[in-house]
């Protein structure tokens, strides 16, 4: 039951991400950004489940391929941050197996690109914010919270594909 | 489902200190940052500080630094607020409640508060 | 310290009306693309509840008639139609800077 499965590693990912904050979040009130969360990407209810997959998907490559930074190996302690990856590495593979037998049943599976595309585009500015920043301990930390927020949003999206299953 | 359950009634005497509880269920009590929140009969909120039970850091708000004392035991899923050197002004309800959406400090769940009352 | 400025402190709005009440901010509570102002509703004897986060966003399971507005310094919180179950006290927060506020509240009665 892959949906299962993946909340589980998902609530995983957060309780490691909530647990590898190293400075307080107060102190950096001033640094908080808005990098435009595209939300709409994470409503299943558009969604085949197939394309819902494949939003998760992308969402979870571009966290780990953020976290597996060298900047991200000096900003956060060694071992969290090896789990963290880890734990993201496992979903990875179970939404890859997922996808190979989801498409074996449906009919016509159809790429979201645009949704893909804006999962992308919100990484970017993700990315440009830790380089404008000089990849500040607040920078870090901002950026920590904003992962938390859409691994959140991700859970909703998690939740309407059981609800399809 | 999430829940803050909050200690009873206190009446206590000027210059005493009181410790109230905050028990926490329905959620990981360690990954997310416990609010409190002091209301005076009749009237508006203030926002006394903050303390993230997963390692025990805390931020206060400078009016109720010397005034609060925020603790955290994680076995037991409860938040505890100390108020010292208690004056007729700390006769209020407390509410612990819950931080929501990470870095924009809203608060989602509140307890349903400990009022206090100073008098001798 | 930033102070919120509720008004009005009262009002009374009849039944399908619209209340509007305003909360102003005496620094900008605004960066980057979000306003960290938030609205509550407090019914007599309970606890406050959140209605709307970052100015605009309604919180999930709120009615669609609230509606919040706003940025920098100037907010503004919309009930439109009000309903009888609307009559409670509303509150605006900053989470801006340290310490966050609150405003001093509105009271909000139905006609």
């Known amino acids: 039951d892959l949906p299962q499965t993946h909340s589980l590693g998902n609530r995983r990912a957060l309780i490691l991400l909530a647990q590898m904050g190293r400075i307080s979040p107060f102190s950096c009130l001033k640094d908080r950004h808005d990098f435009g969360l595209p939300q709409e990407e994470f409503d299943g209810n558009q969604f085949q489940k197939t394309q819902a997959i494949s939003v998760l998907h992308e969402m979870i490559q571009q966290t780990f391929n953020l976290f597996s930074t060298e900047d991200s190996s000096a900003a956060w302690e060694q071992s969290l941050l090896e789990k963290f990856s880890t734990e993201l590495y496992q979903q990875l593979n179970n939404l890859e197996a997922c996808v190979i037998q989801e498409v074996g049943m449906e009919e016509t599976p159809l790429m979201n690109e645009d949704s893909i595309l804006a999962v992308r585009k919100y990484f970017q500015r993700i990315t440009l914010y830790l380089t404008e920043k000089k990849y500040s301990p607040c920078a870090w930390e901002v950026v920590r919270a904003e992962i938390m927020r859409s691994f959140s949003l991700s859970t909703n999206l998690q939740k309407r594909l059981r609800r399809k299953d | 489902q999430v829940q803050l359950q909050e200690s009873g009634t206190v009446l206590a005497r000027p210059g005493a200190s009181v410790k109230m509880s905050c028990k926490a269920s329905g959620y990981s009590f360690t990954t997310y940052w416990m609010h409190w929140v002091k209301q005076r009969p009749g009237q508006g909120l203030e926002w006394i500080g903050v303390?993230?039970?997963?390692?025990?850091?805390?931020t206060y708000n400078q009016k109720f630094k010397d005034k609060a004392k925020l603790t955290a035991v994680t076995s037991a899923n409860t938040a505890y607020m100390e108020l010292s050197s208690l004056t007729n002004e700390d006769s209020a309800v407390y509410f612990c409640t819950r931080n929501y959406k990470y870095d924009y400090y809203t608060m989602d769940y509140w307890g349903q508060g400990t009022t206090v009352t100073v008098s001798s | 310290d930033i102070v919120l400025t509720q008004s009005p402190a009262s009002l009374a709005v009849s039944l399908g009306q619209r209340a509007t009440i305003s909360c102003r901010a005496s620094k900008s509570v605004s960066t980057s693309g979000h306003s960290y102002m938030h609205w509550y509703q407090q019914k007599p004897g309970q606890t406050p509840k959140l209605l709307i986060y970052l100015a605009s966003n309604l919180e999930s399971g709120v009615p669609a008639r609230f509606s919040g507005s706003g940025s920098g310094t100037d907010f503004t919180l919309n009930i439109h139609p009000v309903e009888e179950e609307d009559a409670a006290t509303y509150y605006c927060q900053h989470s801006g800077e340290l310490p966050f506020t609150f405003g001093s509240g509105t009271k909000l009665e139905i006609k």
């Open positions: 303390i993230y039970p997963g390692n025990g850091d805390t």
